[in-house]
Interface confidence: low
C-alpha cells in the first residue's frame, strides 16, 4: 500500500487552530515533475457534505513529502469530507477523513467502519442534543432511510446494513429532520472486495494474518497497519509518537499523538494513534488495552506487562504477542519485515534464529512465493544465535511477494514472513534537455520521465562528439540540479544520454535515448571603436566605426549598435547584418535626447566587447505652432490666411508649411511651403469656387514644428474649375510656388 497518512488535529474548540496534514513516506513523493511523480493534493471534498462558503483554506507545502491545510475560520468549515491524494501512476491513492461537528445533534459512536464483503454493517448515531423529530439516514448524499425518534435504543439510532457489497461503500449520515446538515453524524463505510481473510481478483488468496488491528488489502494482500505499527504483518510496534510504514514519521507537538486522528489508505480508514482513544483521541488507553483506538487487549502471560503503545512487554525468557512462547522454542530474530532488491540481481539473504536446542544450518530454510525452498549455503554460529545465509538465484518480477524464513528444531518451530519487493531499474523515456549553450560548454537538464522504479539515487550523463568512436565521457550529477558540461569544442555536435540508477546493487538502468546538442560558435574578441557620428536631423544620426586590424579571417556576423536613453530608461538596438559594414544611419530617434552610443561585434548569438561609449545630443524638435490662424475668402478661387508667429522660438524660422484639404474630401492633403518666414500672411490661389476648405500650418527651424489649429473657409460662388491651389505671400506676387 502507498505510505500516505492524513492527520487531523482534533483540538476543535477554535477552528483557527485546526489543521490537516498529509504526509507521504513514498520515495520522491510530491515533487511535482514528470520524473518524480505528481504532487500531494489535500482538499475539502464538497460533493457530498456541503458547508457554507467561507474564506479559502490555506495550503502550505513543507518540503516534498508534506502538505498542510489551515485557515478554518468557523466550526462549519471543519464538518465534512477531506481527502489527500498521493502516489504516482497506478499507485495513486486517495485517503479520506470525515469530520463530525463536536456540537452536532447526533454523533457517530465510530466514524470509520471497515467490513468484509457479505458482512452486516451497523452504524450507530448517538444522541448528543435531542430533538423530537425523525432521523434521516443518507448514503453518499442521497436519501436512504428514516427512523422515527421513538426508535432510539439507549440514546442511539442504529442503521443495520445486512450482506454489504463493495458498492455500498461511501459516506453515510444521520440527521434530525429539519436540522442543519452540520448537525449530522457522518460515517464512512469501507467494504472490502473480499470475505474475511481473503484477497485477490477472485478472492482466492489468503491474507497474511495482519496483527494489531491491521487490515488486509483486498487488491494486493498487504497489511495496512494501524498508526504506530510496522512490518509485513504489523507485528512490530513503533516507538511512542511515531507512525508511517517504517515508523519514520513523528507526531508534532510535545504531547505526541494525543488529539490526532490518523487516516490511512483503504481499507483501513481512520483511527486514533496507538495508545489513544475517544472521539477527540485525547484519552489514554485504560489498563490492559493498547494500540490504535485502544482496541487491542494485552492479555499478557508469564509476568508480561501491558504497554498502551506496543502491547505486552515480556520478561526475560519469554516472547510472543502475549509472552506465551518460551525462549526454548526456536525463534527467528530481527528479520526485516520488508526487503528490496533490483531486478536480475542475485542477493544474499540472512536469517538468524535462536532456541534450545540450538538451530543448525540445516534447520533453517527459506521459502519463495512460488513455494520453492532454498537451503542455506553457509551458517555463522554464534553463542546466542545461528545466522543462515541464502544465495538467491537471479531475481525476476514474479519473485515479488511474501517470502518465509522457517526454523525447525526438536523444541518446536517458528517462521517469519517478510515481503520482498523486486524493483525495476529506471530507464529514461526521453533525452535530456538543452538549457543554454556557449562555445565551450552546454547546460543540460537531466530531469526526464522514466519507466521502472524510483527513487532515483544517481543520474549519469554520458556524452561524446557526434559520430565519434572515442570513449564516452561520464559525469555523475545530483538528480534535481542542472548540469554544465565543460571544456567542449566550439561549434561541435555532441551526443548526450542519461542513465538513471536507483538504490541498491544492480540499480543502474539502461541508457536513455541520445540527443544532439551543439556548442555555440566562438565569441568575437575584437573591440570596435566609434570613429564619429553626424546628426542628420532631429531624429536621425549617422554613425561610423572601425575595427583593429588582425591577421586571419574576421570572426563575426555583424554589428550591434546600442543607444541608451538614460532619461527614459529605454534602450534602442540596431542590427547591422554585414561584418564589412563600418557605417549606419539610425532613424526614428527622439529629438532633443541625450543618447549613450556603443557598438559591438556579434557572432552567432554571442556578443563581443562593446566599444567605449560616445555621448550624442540630438537637437530638439521643431518650433511651437503658429498662433491665431485665420482664413478669409477673397474670390471664387482665392483664400487669404493670416497668423501670428509662434512664441518662445528656439531659433530663427526657416519656413512655414501650409496644409490644404477639401472639407469632407477623401483625397490626400496638399502641403505648400511659405519660404519667407518673416511673413504673417499668404494668399492661396487656384481654388475651386463654392468649395469648403480646411487649413492648418506649422513652422520649421531644424525640424518641423507642431501644427496650428485647423480653420475652415469657403471660396466665393460660381467661378470656373481651377487647376489647383497655389499660394502667394504678401510682397511676393510674382513668385508663385506650388
Amino acid at each position: 500500500a502507498v505510505d500516505l497518512t492524513l492527520l487531523a488535529n482534533l483540538r476543535l474548540t477554535d477552528p483557527q487552530r485546526f489543521f490537516l496534514t498529509c504526509v507521504s513516506g513514498e520515495a520522491g513523493a510530491g515533487r511535482g515533475s514528470d520524473a518524480w511523480g505528481p504532487p500531494l493534493l489535500l482538499e475539502k471534498d464538497d460533493r457530498i457534505v456541503r458547508t457554507p462558503p467561507g474564506p479559502p483554506l490555506r495550503l502550505a507545502r513543507n518540503g516534498s513529502h508534506q502538505v498542510t491545510l489551515r485557515g478554518f475560520s468557523k466550526p462549519s468549515d471543519l464538518v465534512g469530507v477531506f481527502s489527500c491524494v498521493g502516489g504516482a501512476g497506478a499507485r495513486r491513492t486517495r485517503v479520506i477523513y470525515v469530520h463530525n461537528s463536536p456540537g452536532a445533534h447526533l454523533l457517530p459512536d465510530k466514524v470509520t467502519h471497515t467490513v468484509n464483503k457479505g458482512d452486516t454493517a451497523v452504524l450507530s448515531a448517538r444522541v448528543h442534543k435531542e430533538k423530537q423529530t425523525d432521523v434521516i439516514w443518507k448514503s453518499n448524499g442521497s436519501y436512504f432511510y428514516t427512523l422515527d425518534w421513538h426508535e432510539a435504543q439507549d440514546g442511539r439510532f442504529l442503521l443495520q446494513l445486512p450482506n454489504v457489497q463493495p458498492p455500498s461503500s461511501g459516506i453515510y449520515s444521520a440527521t434530525y429532520l429539519e436540522a442543519s446538515p452540520l448537525g449530522s453524524a457522518f460515517f464512512r463505510l469501507i467494504v472490502r472486495g473480499c470475505g474475511a481473510g481473503r484477497w485477490g481478483p477472485g478472492c482466492t488468496k489468503e491474507c497474511p494474518g495482519c496483527l494489531h488491528g491491521g487490515v488486509c488489502h483486498d487488491h494486493d494482500g498487504e497489511c495496512v497497519c494501524p498508526p504506530g505499527f510496522t512490518g509485513t504483518r504489523c507485528e512490530q510496534a513503533c516507538r511512542e509518537g511515531r507512525f508511517g510504514q517504517s515508523c519514520q514519521e513523528q507526531c508534532p507537538g510535545i504531547s505526541g499523538c494525543r488529539g490526532l486522528t490518523f487516516c490511512l489508505p483503504d481499507p483501513y480508514g481512520c483511527s486514533c494513534g496507538s495508545g489513544w482513544r475517544g472521539s477527540q483521541c485525547q484519552e489514554a488507553c485504560a489498563p490492559g488495552h493498547f494500540g490504535a483506538d485502544c482496541r487491542l487487549q494485552c492479555q499478557c502471560q508469564n509476568g508480561g506487562t501491558c504497554d498502551r503503545f506496543s502491547g505486552c512487554v515480556c520478561p526475560s525468557g519469554w516472547h510472543g504477542v502475549h509472552c506465551e512462547k518460551s525462549d526454548r522454542i526456536p525463534q527467528i530474530l530481527n528479520m526485516a519485515s520488508e526487503l528490496e532488491f533490483n531486478l536480475e540481481t542475485m542477493p544474499r539473504i540472512n536469517c538468524a534464529a535462536a532456541g534450545n536446542p540450538f538451530p543448525v544450518r540445516g534447520s533453517i530454510e527459506l521459502r519463495k512465493p512460488d513455494g520453492t525452498v532454498l537451503l542455506s549455503t553457509k551458517a555463522i554460529v554464534e553463542p546466542e544465535k545461528t545466522t543462515a545465509e541464502f544465495e538467491v538465484p537471479r531475481l525476476v518480477l514474479a519473485d515479488s511477494g511474501f517470502w518465509e524464513c522457517r526454523v525447525s528444531t526438536s523444541g518446536g518451530q517458528d517462521s517469519r514472513r517478510f515481503k520482498v519487493n523486486v524493483k525495476v531499474p529506471p530507464v529514461p523515456l526521453a533525452a535530456p534537455r538543452l538549457l543554454t549553450k556557449q562555445s565551450r560548454q552546454l547546460v543540460v537538464s537531466p530531469l526526464v520521465s522514466f519507466s521502472g522504479d524510483g527513487p532515483i539515487s544517481t543520474v549519469r550523463l554520458h556524452y561524446r562528439p557526434q559520430d565519434s568512436t572515442m570513449d564516452w565521457s561520464t559525469i555523475v550529477v545530483d538528480p534535481s540540479e542542472n548540469v554544465t558540461l565543460m571544456n567542449l569544442r566550439p561549434k561541435t555536435g555532441y551526443s548526450v544520454r542519461v542513465q538513471l540508477s536507483r538504490p541498491g546493487e544492480g540499480g543502474e538502468g539502461a541508457w536513455g535515448p541520445p540527443t544532439l546538442m551543439t556548442t555555440d560558435c566562438p565569441e568575437p574578441l575584437l573591440q570596435p571603436w566609434l570613429e564619429g557620428w553626424h546628426v542628420e536631423g532631429t531624429d536621425r544620426l549617422r554613425v561610423s566605426w572601425s575595427l583593429p586590424l588582425v591577421p586571419g579571417p574576421l570572426v563575426g556576423d555583424g554589428f550591434l549598435l546600442r543607444l541608451w536613453d538614460g532619461t527614459r530608461g529605454q534602450e534602442r538596438r540596431e542590427n547591422v547584418s554585414s561584418p564589412q559594414a563600418r557605417t549606419a544611419l539610425l532613424t526614428g530617434l527622439t529629438p532633443g535626447t541625450h543618447y549613450q552610443l556603443d557598438v559591438q561585434l556579434y557572432h552567432c548569438t554571442l556578443l563581443g566587447p562593446a566599444s567605449p561609449p560616445a555621448h550624442v545630443l540630438l537637437p530638439p524638435s521643431g518650433p511651437p505652432a503658429p498662433r491665431h490662424l485665420h482664413a478669409q475668402a477673397l474670390s471664387d478661387s482665392e483664400i487669404q490666411l493670416t497668423w501670428k508667429h509662434p512664441e518662445a522660438l528656439p531659433g530663427p524660422i526657416s519656413k512655414y508649411v501650409v496644409e490644404v484639404q477639401v472639407a469632407g474630401g477623401a483625397g490626400d492633403p496638399l502641403w505648400i511651403d511659405v519660404d519667407r518666414p518673416e511673413e504673417t500672411s499668404t494668399i492661396i490661389r487656384g481654388l475651386n469656387a463654392s468649395t469648403r476648405y480646411l487649413f492648418r500650418m506649422r513652422a520649421s527651424i531644424q525640424g518641423l514644428g507642431d501644427w496650428s489649429n485647423t480653420v475652415e473657409e469657403s471660396t466665393l460662388g460660381n467661378g470656373l474649375q481651377a487647376e489647383g491651389p497655389v499660394q502667394e505671400s504678401r510682397a511676393a506676387e510674382e513668385g508663385l510656388d506650388q
Epitope: 474548540t13 477554535d14 457554507p52 468557523k74 462549519s76 436540522a179 442543519s180
Partner: antibody
Amino acid sequence: EVQLLESGGGLVQPGGSLRLSCAASGFTFSHYKMSWVRQAPGKGLEWVSSIYPSGGWTYYADSVKGRFTISRDNSKNTLYLQMNSLRAEDMAVYYCARDRPGAFDVWGQGTMVTVSS
Amino acid sequence: DIQMTQSPGTLSLSPGERATLSCRASQSVSSSYLAWYQQKPGQAPRLLIYDASSRATGIPDRFSGSGSGTDFTLTISRLEPEDFAVYYCQQYGRSPSFGPGTKVDIK
C-alpha cells in the same frame, strides 16, 4: 475593533412581546455562531439561545422554548431575539455574545428587559 | 441537562495571594468543553479560559485552568487589585450551562 451592541430592551407587561437586536461590527458576522445569554438582577448567567452562521440551526434553553425565537440577518450583521408571552421570570439583562463555538468570547454591554404590570 | 456547581461561593483573599476556584459538573463534560468568565459589577462577562485550559486572547498568564471529566479548577497565581470580581464556569459539551459563580473579594 470587535463590537456587539444590543438594543430593544424596555418595560413590557406580562404576556407581552419584545424584539431585541444586536448589531455586530469588526468581524465577519456570517462566519460565527451567535448566542443570547441573560442575567436576572443579582443572579448568575443563563444561556438562552444560539444560532449557527447559516441561520438554519437554532436551539433554545428549555425555559424559553416555544416563546422565544432567535434569528439573524447576515447581510445586516444583526442578531435578533423575538420574545413572546413574556413572564416575570424573563426579567433580566440580555447579552448578545459571539460563540467560538460554545465558549462566548465577545459580549455586548447588555440591554435590560423589565416585565411588570 | 448538565448542572454546574461552584465552590466556594465567596473567596476572601488579599492582593498577591493565590486563588483556587472549583467547578463541578453533574456529568462528564465531553472533550473538556469548559470555559471560565470574569464579571465585574455593571459590566458584561469576559472570557478567560476555554477548552478547560486554553487562555483566551489578551488574558494574563496568572490565570490558568485545569481539569477534565467532571472536576475543573481556575487558578489565579497572584491576585492583582483588578482581579476581584465574580467568576463563572460554563460547560458547552451539551446545551450550554453556567455555574452560580464564585465571588472573589478583598479580605
